[in-house]
Amino acid sequence: TEVKVTQPEKSVSVAAGDSTILNCTVTSLLPVGPIRWYRGVGQSRLLIYSFTGEHFPRIRNVSDTTKRNNMDFSIRISNVTPEDAGTYYCVKFQRGSSEPDTEIQSGGGTEVYVLAK
């Protein structure tokens, strides 16, 4: 059965300087491969967070993703700035063998509105 990626909120509003949570759950961890968050779409999309061990300033996972059955890949963005506004996508990849990982499913996106303090 196909993996489903769910982003329950179509949009969230957050005041500049505050934190916000972007929710994302998946229905399966198979096929194996990382889950990443992007802002925007297409060639110009920006990698925001990857659940592959690297450190990303201001962003952290919400749940304990070291649980082997974890299906919650929500993130918290701290100290939000106006530059953080945009649509965020939670994306499930299948690991590549000798080629790059392949995107297999994306959530519907969550638009982040940043309000003036």
């Epitope: 961890l29 198979l30 096929p31 194996v32 990382p34 659940f51 592959t52 061990g53 304990d64 993703t65 070291t66 649980k67 082997r68 059955n69 299948q94 690991r95 063998s97 000798s98």
Partner: antibody, heavy 118, light 109 residues
């Protein structure tokens, strides 16, 4: 520098118990899942237990399930393996290992020898 | 018995290329790693996530995968590479960490 130092090994009689410890330093222990891997004399590697970073979820192969218990104390940066109902076939060097994001192992301790013998 | 299969031994002359294979896991549910172990020492991680090499590991060690078989390649083998090499995996479908039985690499001469 990541360091993992095991202790608590020794000689124990069949049916006995032993608790191994692994002191971790050089990384944020509370952010990493951890595992125990053993190696019987002259044999290959065998994974025996894993635990999530927060300690709430544990994992075991059938060979030790119900006899071994993995736990951790993040305030002390220490990993534990409680071994009960020990058998001769549990004789091995026991290594603690840090897990990567996808549950492979990137750093290993030097190991501690457990001998189960009457 | 071991869930992953690798050859018991491989022999190679210094300067040549050694290849050690590992099979048995489902490609859709497994990640793979390679570990080196010298006599009396703890294992050392050479490759993780199929083909990622820790920063302290020489570039002559590389990992690759094709279908359900993964391969450790050691280019320009040196005498110090003589050791046991273990293929290890993480199986997402069972939450377990199987190993291969190990391959003894002998450097001839």
């Amino acid at each position: 520098e990541v360091q993992l130092v095991e202790s608590g090994g020794g000689v124990v009689q069949p049916g006995g118990s032993l608790r191994l410890s692994c002191a971790a330093s050089g990384f944020t222990f509370s952010s990493n899942a951890m595992s125990w891997v053993r190696q019987a004399p002259g044999k290959g590697l065998e994974w025996v237990a894993g635990i999530s970073a927060g300690g709430s979820d544990t994992y075991y192969p059938a060979s030790v399930k119900g006899r071994f218990t993995i736990s951790r104390d993040n305030s002390k940066n220490t990993l534990y393996l409680q071994m009960n109902s020990l058998r001769a076939e549990d004789t091995a060097v026991y290594y603690c290992a840090r897990e990567t994001w996808n549950h492979l192992f990137d750093y290993w301790g030097q190991g501690t020898l457990v001998t189960v013998s009457s | 018995s071991y869930e992953l299969t690798q050859p018991p031994s491989v022999s190679v002359s210094p300067g040549q290329t050694a290849r050690i294979t590992c099979s048995g896991g489902s490609y859709s549910s497994y990640y793979y790693a390679w570990y080196q172990q010298k006599p009396g020492q703890a294992p050392v991680t050479l490759i993780y996530s199929d083909d990622k090499r820790p920063s302290n590991i020489p570039e002559r060690f590389s990992g690759s995968s094709s279908g359900t078989t993964v391969t450790l390649t050691i280019s320009g083998v040196q005498a110090e590479d003589e050791a046991d090499y273990y293929c290890g995996g993480y199986d997402q479908s069972s939450y377990t960490n199987p190993f291969g039985g190990g391959t003894k690499l002998t450097v001839l001469g």
